[in-house]
Amino acid sequence: FIIGFGISGRHSITVTTLTSAGNIGEDGILSCTFEPDIKLSDIVIQWLKEGVTGLVHEFKKGKDDLSDQDEMFRGRTAVFADQVIVGNASLRLKNVQLTDAGTYKCYIITSKGKGNAKLEYKTGAFSIPEVNVDSNASSESLRCEAPRWFPQPTVVWASQVDQGANFSEVSNTSFELNPENVTMKVVSVLYNVTINTTYSCMIENDIAKATGDIRVTDSEIKRQSHLQLLNSKAS
């Protein structure tokens, strides 16, 4: 926890943030909570970003005040106004950009005192992979596709049966730049697969880890997928 120091006779209050990741082109949330105050009009929330002159967002006297908002955040931010009274100062951020990455500060003033906490916001692209039987291949193969990743991830195949196996020799992975010239489509093909075995396609960069599982039997195909954001920690 990071505690703001008391100023002018006021006590310090506890402010808690959660390091998080934003998926570029999507909408994100920068998490921040604080000790609640019973009077909304006494609460001031300021979001600041290191290296940015203007404010990211300001909420005071029960409403937004965007007079000093930096141009890069114009029309892109909102707090959950109805939840401020219960100590939620989290910020909604529209259309996350790569340039939104950095260190943010959630600064709170209430009638109880002042406090702030920093938050590291990482930005990139991540998506859930879809694994299918590759009907184009000459031998029995699996195709793992994920539409949006950045930075370039690593792709590893694994098998439930042969857990220590290295499939790099029997797989081929390609990265295709998407039209917006930032994110990439990930395609990986695994050759010579065995029926009645569960295979996992694992895609990972420094922001997220995603897994697509597939099990092909004589009668059915079972799929499962999972996405996990990395390094989410409280401050």
Epitope: G25, K63, D64, D65, L66, S67, G75, R92, K94
Partner: antibody, heavy 120, light 107 residues
Framework: QLQLQESGPGLVKPSETLSLTCTVS??????????WGWIRQPPGKGLEWIGN???????YYNPSLRSRVTISVDTSKNQFSLKLSSVTAADTAVYYC????????????WGQGTLVTVSS | EIVMTQSPATLSVSPGERATLSCRAS??????LAWYQQKPGQAPRLLIY???TRATGIPARFSGSGSGTEFTLTISSLQSEDFAVYYC?????????FGGGTKVEIK
């Protein structure tokens, strides 16, 4: 209930400057969670966003019109204004003013609109 | 800029029937989309924002769905006052842009 009302000349000569004012009633233009925007609609066509302004005076314009557009605000009169310079017949349209959410950025409510014809 | 494409251009529906209007974005706009209704000689009226949230005072027969690039406005049972032109608008990135509109007319 918040209401917006556009006013200004209905006829402007080519190459001159179109000037419109939007008067806000039933609420303050200083309301912090909103921008104040202009949208236009040529006869029988679709809608085009022109730009917006915050009560503090900061503006954002549609790049296609940026070189010709100025939006200003007068908080003492609860008004904001649009100026569009060097007009041509292509600028003939119904011009609407509207309140624009700071985020989400939907337009609500709208003024009833005023037709501006560019003709000599 | 993001191009918004609406289809069909005209939709002929009988009163009481369901109307389904489509809006497609040239790139993902997440859920940052609004729908408006415009009647002849009137200003547009906000129906839906956030792709699926009904604006204040809008009847429950209007519903919005979709995210990313594909969106739908559904009018479950058309009333006489619903015959109008409907526009979608993205506010995901500047400049905000509108679709070309769908005219819902009486069949």
């Amino acid at each position: 209930q918040l209401q917006l009302q556009e006013s200004g000349p209905g006829l402007v000569k080519p190459s001159e400057t179109l000037s419109l004012t939007c008067t806000v009633s039933g609420g303050s233009i200083k309301s912090g969670s909103y921008y104040w925007g202009w949208i236009r609609q040529p006869p029988g066509k679709g809608l085009e966003w022109i730009g917006n302004i915050y009560y503090s005076g900061s503006t954002y314009y549609n790049p296609s019109l940026r070189s010709r557009v100025t939006i200003s605000v007068d908080t003492s009169k609860n008004q904001f204004s649009l100026k569009l310079s060097s007009v041509t017949a292509a600028d003939t349209a119904v011009y609407y003013c509207a309140r624009e959410g700071s985020y989400p950025n939907q337009f609500d409510p709208w003024g009833q609109g005023t037709l501006v014809t560019v003709s000599s | 800029e993001i191009v918004m494409t609406q289809s069909p251009a005209t939709l002929s529906v009988s009163p009481g029937e369901r109307a389904t209007l489509s809006c497609r974005a040239s790139q993902s706009v997440s859920s940052n989309l609004a729908w408006y209704q415009q009647k002849p000689g009137q200003a547009p009226r906000l129906l839906i924002y956030g792709a699926s949230t009904r604006a204040t005072g809008i009847p429950a027969r209007f519903s919005g769905s979709g995210s990313g690039t594909e969106f739908t406005l559904t009018i479950s049972s058309l009333q006489s006052e619903d015959f109008a032109v409907y526009y979608c608008q993205q506010y995901h990135s500047f400049p905000f842009t509108f679709g070309g509109g769908t005219k819902v007319e009486i069949k």
